[in-house]
């Protein structure tokens, strides 16, 4: 039985040109995390394999930094980065857990005026 839960940063916003940390945390399970995939819609951003380390997709290699931990840092944000991001935890023996983060990238002036999503 899958007992674990994924905690994420929920809905977040960031300034155009800035950076953001995408972070998920798996709790309430003793399952071993073998791999975490970071995906956006149909695109693979990165994979962190517990043994082999990080794989960064070439289309993101200049804008993505591994970590902290199993998280992912997105840099040089553009408005096109707005959207859903998924952390997919591959675990043994439980199987797969998926967390969702919604990122909105705002023009600097808007971000400076404090427009923020509430984290549920």
């Amino acid at each position: 039985m899958m007992t674990g839960t994924i905690e994420t940063t929920g809905n977040i916003s960031a300034e155009k040109g800035g950076s953001i940390i995408l972070q998920c945390h798996l709790s309430s399970t003793t399952a071993q995390v073998t791999q975490v995939n970071w995906e956006q819609q149909d695109q693979l951003l990165a994979i962190c394999n517990a043994d082999l380390g990080w794989h960064i997709s070439p289309s993101f290699k200049d804008r993505v930094a591994p970590g902290p931990g199993l998280g992912l840092t997105l840099q040089s944000l553009t408005v096109n980065d707005t959207g859903e991001y998924f952390c997919i935890y591959h675990t043994y023996p439980d199987g797969t857990y998926t967390g969702r983060i919604f990122l909105e990238v705002l023009e600097s002036s808007v971000a400076e005026h404090g427009a923020r999503f509430q984290i549920p």
Epitope: T34, E39, L44, N49, L52, G53, H55
Partner: antibody, heavy 119, light 107 residues
Framework: EVQLVQSGAEVKKPGASVKISCKTS????????MHWVKQAPGKGLEWIGG????????SYNQKFKGRATLTVDKSTNTAYMELSSLRSEDTAVYYC????????????WGQGTLVTVSS | DIQLTQSPSSLSASVGDRVTITCKAS??????VAWYQQKPGKAPKLLIY???YRNTGVPDRFSGSGSGTDFTFTISSLQPEDFATYYC?????????FGQGTKLEIK
């Protein structure tokens, strides 16, 4: 120039063990994963496992777990694969292959080592 | 484990022909697919990584495309040195797996 040079061909009896070496040069050994791949005569490619030298992380294909042991010697920039309890179906060419930088595909390969298991 | 099925298994073609090989994954692997060329008695050589990126020094007659479960490898105009066996590989999850190979022969 990146180079992966493997040890020579081996002939072994069933039940024995074999240890293949892969001596590397031309890059920072600890920064790249080393994969091992099997190719039986006239057959396709089969991933045995991979090892990350900087932290010693190893991922094995379950099919080979328990019989294959991947190790490295960071002082000589050499990777090793030992295969135990050999049987006839282990007769194959074994390749070491360097994982590309921050990727899992393999961009440089050794020349291969033929292991023949025969009584 | 993720299965990769290549088609065709073998193919006869002539110099100058356009050749396409397909690779179908048993589950979604996003773009985590590489293509290798292997000549008899030699080690495989990386041609394409992450589905569509040419490796350094690979001629632009070689190309790759696809995402999800369906991938395509194309040689736009066959050269004599291209006759070899080609393999796709997924690196979305371990154990990394290869297709069974496609042998490209001279017609």
């Amino acid at each position: 120039e990146v180079q992966l040079v493997q040890s020579g061909a081996e002939v072994k009896k069933p039940g024995a063990s074999v240890k293949i070496s892969c001596k590397t040069s031309g890059y920072t050994f600890t920064e790249f994963t080393m994969h091992w791949v099997k190719q039986a005569p006239g057959k396709g490619l089969e991933w045995i496992g991979g090892l990350k030298p900087d932290n010693g992380g190893i991922s094995y294909n379950q099919k080979f777990k328990g019989r294959a042991t991947l190790t490295v010697d960071k002082s000589t920039n050499t990777a090793y694969m030992e295969l135990s309890s050999l049987r006839s179906e282990d007769t194959a060419v074994y390749y070491c292959a360097r994982g590309a930088y921050y990727r899992y595909d393999a961009d440089y390969w050794g020349q291969g080592t033929l292991v023949t298991v025969s009584s | 484990d993720i299965q990769l099925t290549q088609s065709p298994s073998s193919l006869s073609a002539s110099v100058g022909d356009r050749v396409t090989i397909t690779c179908k994954a048993s589950q979604d692997v996003k773009t985590a697919v590489a293509w290798y060329q292997q000549k008899p008695g030699k080690a495989p050589k990386l041609l394409i990584y992450s589905a569509s990126y040419r490796n350094t020094g690979v001629p632009d007659r070689f190309s790759g495309s696809g995402s999800g479960t369906d991938f395509t490898f194309t040689i736009s105009s066959l050269q004599p040195e291209d006759f070899a066996t080609y393999y796709c590989q997924q690196h979305y999850s371990t154990p990394f797996t290869f297709g069974q190979g496609t042998k490209l022969e001279i017609k």
